[in-house]
């Protein structure tokens, strides 16, 4: 259904990184433009990037007023130049997302190894807690605030000359691994999830080497 | 475990007033969009009315338009569907649902009888 | 108003049988659109929604497919306790509308 000049939105697609969060779709408009509304299972639809050309519109602000909650987001095709114009059934053409939970689907970003401290034989791996988009009283929460023991970091380990991998888990942001006296080692993090059934782990962090700036040595 | 249940119906006569009621729990009221369905005897469905988590946002299919008025009460975990200027037609079984997005019908309750009858 | 019309209005079947009942809308809905059961004086009982999506703690067997004017449900083997009548509906605008109804019967 529709006006003959406009054509439905399809692939709509989310895409989300520590909550900041997008969605896209096509096609390219061609004499049409495009509003997005946003809704939870309430069905109190909010309209965002009125009447645009783009093929993609920031929805970050609404989901993270609830990061739990289920959000689909319905795009609207309307004929540019006349944007009262409505379809057939006296609705402009839309096409709805797919269902959109923040908590459980939006992707875990890049963690970035902090810091490490190396005292004797054992080093100290400090993971940045990064901050997130959402909010509350008005501070911006980070990682570990939103997932609490939800979220675990992942590090992996290995003596800067060998191949042979080692690895440690954490409920913090920290690790403490027993390394060998005066030996390198070089070691990447990565973010999990483990409840998740889809986006359980973030890419690999950069990875660090002892004896870079990063790094602290005490005997 | 989703809960729906009506209450309200009976027998009114034509142009008689009643209000159904649909008593709600097991989940977060407030956060689903509600719906009225109703079912003439021996007939199919009927969508009648629907109405938005926050109750800002009503919809009503045409028969019903300025007779039937659709509202929620959040803090009681309560929809209503208040009926005026009944007619023979309205006469049916009225069923509560809950409706995700204010689009499909997701749980039902059991159904309330309405009689329009002089 | 957008119309929907199904077909068969009824239909005999046996247990383990393959069934198809076919919804066609007077317009094109995209996949918005739901399949419910019913059993003689009880409520409604959702099956399907968007189209081919499975509500939660239905079985397998039910399936749905389509997109645009056209859907089917399909319940793959037929169980005793699936036969009912059976309903779609359109939400892509508002008034929202239902088939007529299919009543699955047995054979």
């Known amino acids: 259904s529709g006006t003959t000049n406009t054509v439905a939105a399809y692939n709509l697609t989310w895409k989300s990184t520590n909550f900041k969060t997008i969605l896209e779709w096509e096609p390219k408009p061609v004499n049409q433009v495009y509003t997005v509304q946003i809704s939870t299972k309430s069905g109190d639809w909010k309209s965002k990037c009125f009447y645009t050309t783009d093929t993609e519109c920031d929805l970050t602000d609404e989901i993270v007023k609830d990061v739990k909650q289920t959000y689909l987001a319905r795009v609207f095709s309307y004929p540019a130049g006349n944007v009262e114009s409505t379809g057939s059934a006296g609705e402009p053409l839309y096409e709805n997302s797919p269902e959109f939970t923040p908590y459980l689907e939006t992707n875990l970003g890049q963690p970035t190894i902090q810091s490490f401290e190396q005292v004797g034989t054992k080093v100290n791996v400090t993971v940045e807690d990064e901050r997130t988009l959402v909010r509350r009283n008005n501070t911006f929460l980070s990682l570990r605030d939103v997932f609490g023991k939800d979220l675990i970091y992942t590090l992996y380990y290995w003596k800067d000359s060998s191949t042979g991998r080692k690895t440690n888990t954490t409920h913090t942001n920290e690790f403490l691994i027993d390394v060998e006296k005066g030996v390198s080692y070089c070691f990447f993090a990565q973010a999990v999830i483990p409840s998740r059934t889809v986006n359980r782990k973030s890419t690999d962090s950069p990875v660090e080497c002892m004896g870079q700036e990063k790094g602290e040595f005490r005997e | 475990e989703v809960q729906l249940l009506e209450s309200g119906g009976g027998l009114v006569q034509p142009g008689g007033s009643l209000r159904l009621s649909c008593a709600a729990s097991?989940?977060?009221?407030?956060?689903?969009?509600m719906s009225w369905v109703r079912q003439a005897p021996g007939k199919g469905l009927e969508w009648v009315s629907s109405?938005?988590?926050?109750?800002?946002?009503?919809y009503y299919t045409d028969s019903v338009k300025g007779r039937f008025t659709i509202s929620r009460d959040n803090s009681k975990n309560t929809l209503y569907l208040q009926m005026n200027s009944l007619r023979a037609e309205d006469t049916a079984v009225y069923y509560c649902?809950?409706?995700?997005?204010?689009?499909?019908?997701?749980?039902w309750g059991q159904g309330t009888l309405v009689t329009v009858s002089s | 108003d957008i119309q929907m019309t199904q077909s068969p209005p009824s239909l005999s079947a046996s247990a383990g049988d393959r069934v198809t009942i076919t919804c066609r809308a007077s317009?094109?809905?995209?996949?918005?659109l739901a399949w419910y059961q019913q059993k003689p004086e009880k409520a409604p009982k959702s099956l399907i929604y968007?189209?081919?999506s499975l509500q939660s703690g239905v079985p397998s067997r039910f399936s749905g497919s389509g997109s645009g004017t056209d859907f089917t449900l399909t319940i793959s083997s037929l169980q005793p306790e699936d036969f009912a009548t059976y309903y779609c509906?359109?939400?892509?605008?508002?008034?929202?509308?239902f088939g007529q109804g299919t009543k699955l019967e047995i054979k």
């Open positions: 649902a809950r409706s995700p997005w204010g689009y499909y019908l997701d749980s």
């Open positions: 097991g989940f977060t009221f407030s956060n689903y969009a």
């Open positions: 109405i938005s988590g926050s109750g800002d946002y009503t």
């Open positions: 317009q094109g809905i995209s996949s918005r």
């Open positions: 968007a189209a081919s």
């Open positions: 509906q359109q939400y892509n605008s508002y008034p929202y509308t």
